[in-house]
Amino acid sequence: LTCLGGFASPGPVPPSTALRELIEELVNITQNQKAPLCNGSMVWSINLTAGMYCAALESLINVSGCSAIEKTQRMLSGFCPHKVSAGQFSSLHVRDTKIEVAQFVKDLLLHLKKLFREGQFN
């Protein structure tokens, strides 16, 4: 978690900074959304609990050819302790529910904002 912050970071980034940067990236995606995000692609909904970073990455990694979420995918990989590849699913997915990427991002953003406000970074 402390190695987050993007490829250009000069050194380790505190967890609070990493989470803040992920939130700000999700805000950018939400604010800059003009056409349907990722052409309206659908992803598995996830339970926003412990392990959600990996679950979120597992969902989003199945969206290909969407430059708008590439940075988010990279940032989420820094929060996830194991390597995630397309087609991989954890028990945290709500496997009977698919939602649009835009809604997924909105839900994730709200949850992360709550965690950040409460000072829960890990």
Epitope: E24, L110, E118
Partner: antibody, heavy 119, light 107 residues
Framework: QVQLKESGPGLVQPSQTLSLTCTVS????????VQWVRQPPGKGLEWMGV???????SFNSVLKSRLSISRDTSKSQVFLKMSSLQTEDTATYYC??????????????WGQGVMVTVS | DIQMTQSPHSLSASLGETVSIECLAS??????LAWYQQKPGKSPQLLIY???RLQDGVPSRFSGSGSGTQFSLKISNMQPEDEGVYYC?????????FGSGTKLELK
């Protein structure tokens, strides 16, 4: 246009419970968060708590044990209840809309406020 | 809790003058700072959020700057309608906290 309006009793007796209603228009409670802020006469502003757009709540830890926030989305109303009122709870109580699509929490629209006296 | 310290407590300015109000956070809040104006008997009104972003409808003579722990609000070309109390607010961590306010009067 965006509007918020607080309503509730102007006078509450000590040890009683305060119940306030914030009725909103021009936006949906499922898309925006609603915050509660109070201001004692001649004093500064104190954040009380928030009703998140998904129905969750967060509170100022100083008030948490006495406070509850709920909502009725069909009526576009948010409710604040605060128990065990004391004279120091005398204040103008505001509900305000949160900026929401931003990384920070700020208040972009405010109600006109309701003055509550504890006596 | 994050403490927000505002200065000065009050100030008076002449018409057309430029004034600055400072706000100091007790810890780093990035750029998560907002400014409000409150007139007597009225609700606060948002002027600036995210340190420097002007809220719709707010005159461009208002500007904000700073980052980390030190912030300022600048009002260029003081007008009669600028009289009131100004508050800063951090939107970084719960509980959200406000400065104690700066009363601005027309000289």
């Amino acid at each position: 246009q965006v509007q918020l309006k607080e309503s509730g009793p102007g006078l509450v007796q000590p040890s009683q419970t305060l119940s306030l209603t914030c009725t909103v228009s021009g936006f949906s409670l499922t898309n925006y968060h609603v915050q509660w802020v109070r201001q004692p006469p001649g004093k500064g502003l104190e954040w009380m708590g928030v009703m998140w757009s998904d129905g969750d709540t967060s509170f100022n830890s100083v008030l948490k044990s006495r406070l509850s926030i709920s909502r009725d989305t069909s009526k576009s109303q948010v409710f604040l209840k605060m128990s065990s009122l004391q004279t120091e709870d005398t204040a103008t109580y505001y509900c305000a809309r949160d900026g929401t699509i931003a990384a920070m929490d700020y208040f972009d629209y405010w109600g006109q406020g309701v003055m509550v006296t504890v006596s | 809790d994050i403490q927000m310290t505002q200065s000065p407590h009050s100030l008076s300015a002449s018409l057309g003058e430029t004034v600055s109000i400072e706000c100091l956070a007790s810890e780093d809040i990035s750029n998560y700072l907002a400014w409000y104006q409150q007139k007597p008997g009225k609700s606060p009104q948002l002027l600036i959020y995210h340190t420097s972003r002007l809220q719709d409808g707010v005159p461009s003579r208002f500007s904000g700057s700073g980052s980390g722990t030190q912030f300022s609000l600048k009002i260029s070309n003081m007008q009669p309608e600028d009289e009131g109390v100004y508050y800063c607010q951090q939107g970084y961590r719960f509980p959200l906290t406000f400065g104690s306010g700066t009363k601005l009067e027309l000289k």
